[in-house]
C-alpha cells in the first residue's frame, strides 16, 4: 500500500467527522479506507511539511518520536503491518512522560481504543514489546478483560487513560511510532 502524506490544512480537523459512528463497542462492518484517509485528527500540533521536520506530514512530534494515530480498523496484527508499511512500529511506551503524552492524546477520543505494540503468545508467557524488549509493569498495569468466554486476550490497547488486554482479532485503531535521532 502506498502511503500518501496529507498536509495539515490548519483547520480544526476534529470537526471533520472522523470519529462519528466509530465506537470501541461497535466495530462491525468497518469501511475500507486508504492510509491517507485514516490518519487521526488531533488537537496536538502536527507536522505540515512546510518546515524541515524529522516526521512525515500529519504525524505528531513528541520528544524523540513521531506518532500517527491511525483511524483504520484492524486486528492487532493488521495494525502492526500497517505501521510497518509506514516505516514505523506499533507504539512502545518507554517512559512515564511518554505515557502521559499518549494518555492526553487518546483521552480526547473517549469512544476509541488504540492498539499498542505489546502482545504475548498466551497467558503463561510474559508480555513482549514488538521490538522484543521486556515489559515492565513499573510503568503501567495492564487491566485484564479476560472472561470464561474469552480467556485469552493476548494483545494490548489503550482506551482513554487505561491500558487493557484484548483479543488480538478485535478490530481497533492503532498508534504507530517512528523513533528518530536528533
Amino acid at each position: 500500500t502506498m502511503a500518501i502524506w496529507r498536509s495539515n490544512s490548519g483547520s480544526n480537523t476534529l470537526e471533520n467527522g472522523y470519529f462519528l459512528s466509530r465506537n470501541k463497542e461497535n466495530h462491525s462492518q468497518p469501511t475500507q479506507s486508504s492510509l491517507e484517509d485514516s490518519v487521526t485528527p488531533t488537537k496536538a500540533v502536527k507536522t505540515t511539511g512546510v518546515l524541515s521536520s524529522p516526521c512525515p506530514p500529519n504525524w505528531i512530534i513528541y520528544e524523540k518520536s513521531c506518532y500517527l494515530f491511525s483511524m483504520s480498523l484492524n486486528s492487532w496484527d493488521g495494525s502492526k503491518r500497517q505501521c510497518w508499511q509506514l516505516g514505523s512500529n506499533l507504539l512502545k511506551i518507554d517512559s512515564s512522560n511518554e505515557l502521559g503524552f499518549i494518555v492526553k492524546q487518546v483521552s480526547s477520543q473517549p469512544d476509541n481504543s488504540f492498539w499498542i505494540g505489546l502482545s504475548r503468545p498466551q497467558t503463561e508467557v510474559p508480555w513482549l514489546w514488538e521490538d522484543g524488549s521486556t515489559f515492565s509493569s513499573n510503568l503501567f498495569q495492564i487491566r485484564t478483560t479476560a472472561t470464561q468466554e474469552n480467556p485469552s486476550p493476548n494483545c494490548v490497547w489503550i482506551h482513554v487513560s487505561v491500558i487493557y488486554d484484548q483479543l488480538c482479532s478485535v478490530p481497533s485503531y492503532s498508534i504507530c511510532e517512528k523513533k528518530f535521532s536528533m
Partner: antibody, heavy 118, light 107 residues
Framework: QVQLVQSGAEVKKPGASVKVSCKSS????????IHWVRQAPGQGLEWMGW????????NYAQKFQGRITMTRDTSISTAYLELSRLRSDDTAVFYC???????????WGQGTLVTVSS | DIQMTQSPSSVSASVGDRVTITCRAS??????LAWYQQKPGKAPKLLIF???SLQSGVPSRFSGSGSGTDFTLTVSSLQPEDFATYYC?????????FGPGTKVDIE
Amino acid sequence: QVQLVQSGAEVKKPGASVKVSCKSSGYTFTAYYIHWVRQAPGQGLEWMGWINPNSGDTNYAQKFQGRITMTRDTSISTAYLELSRLRSDDTAVFYCARNSGSYSFGYWGQGTLVTVSS
Amino acid sequence: DIQMTQSPSSVSASVGDRVTITCRASQGISSWLAWYQQKPGKAPKLLIFGASSLQSGVPSRFSGSGSGTDFTLTVSSLQPEDFATYYCQQAYSFPFTFGPGTKVDIE
C-alpha cells in the same frame, strides 16, 4: 552494533560444574531477555531457558531444572549460565542469544564449547 | 512440550533453485514461529520471525508463511551462501522448542 561475546572453551570432569559468561554491548542490556541454547556435536538446537536482565527473573526448561542457574551482572552487562552435575552428554556448544521480536533470537554469541570427559 | 517436525530432513539443490522447507507443530502456535540458518562452526542466524516477518538485513529471497500448525520457509532462488542447515523454532509456550533441522546441500 549489538554484540554478545562469550567466554572461552572449557573441559570439565563428570560431576563438576561449569559457568559460561556472555557479555553484551551495543544495546540496553536490561531491556531484552537473554536466552541460552545448547547444541550437542552434530545435533540440533535445544533451548535451556532465559533470564530477564532487568529483574533477574528466570525461566528454565524442565529438563534442566535443579542443575541450571542463570544470573546476570548489570554493572558489566554480562549474563551467566551455570550448569552443575555435568555428564558426558552435556558436551555441547552453549550459545547465549538476545531476544528479538515475537520471542525469536535475533543476536547470538559465538558459542562456548564445553567438553565433559573423564 | 510442543514438538516441532521438519521436512525434508535434507535436500540437494542447485544454485537458482526454489527450495521449500516445511515445519509442523504438534499443536497450534498461531504465528509464534521463527526460522534460522546455521552454517558449520557458526552460531545460528535469524531469518524470519512471527512466521512471516523478514529479519532486518536478510535477503528478500527468503520468505516465511503459515499459521497454526503448518509453516513453510521458501528460498526463491538459492544462492551459493544459502547452503546450510535450517531450523524452525516455536515461541508459543515453554519450553521453546526447535525443529530437528533441514540440511540444504549442493546437488
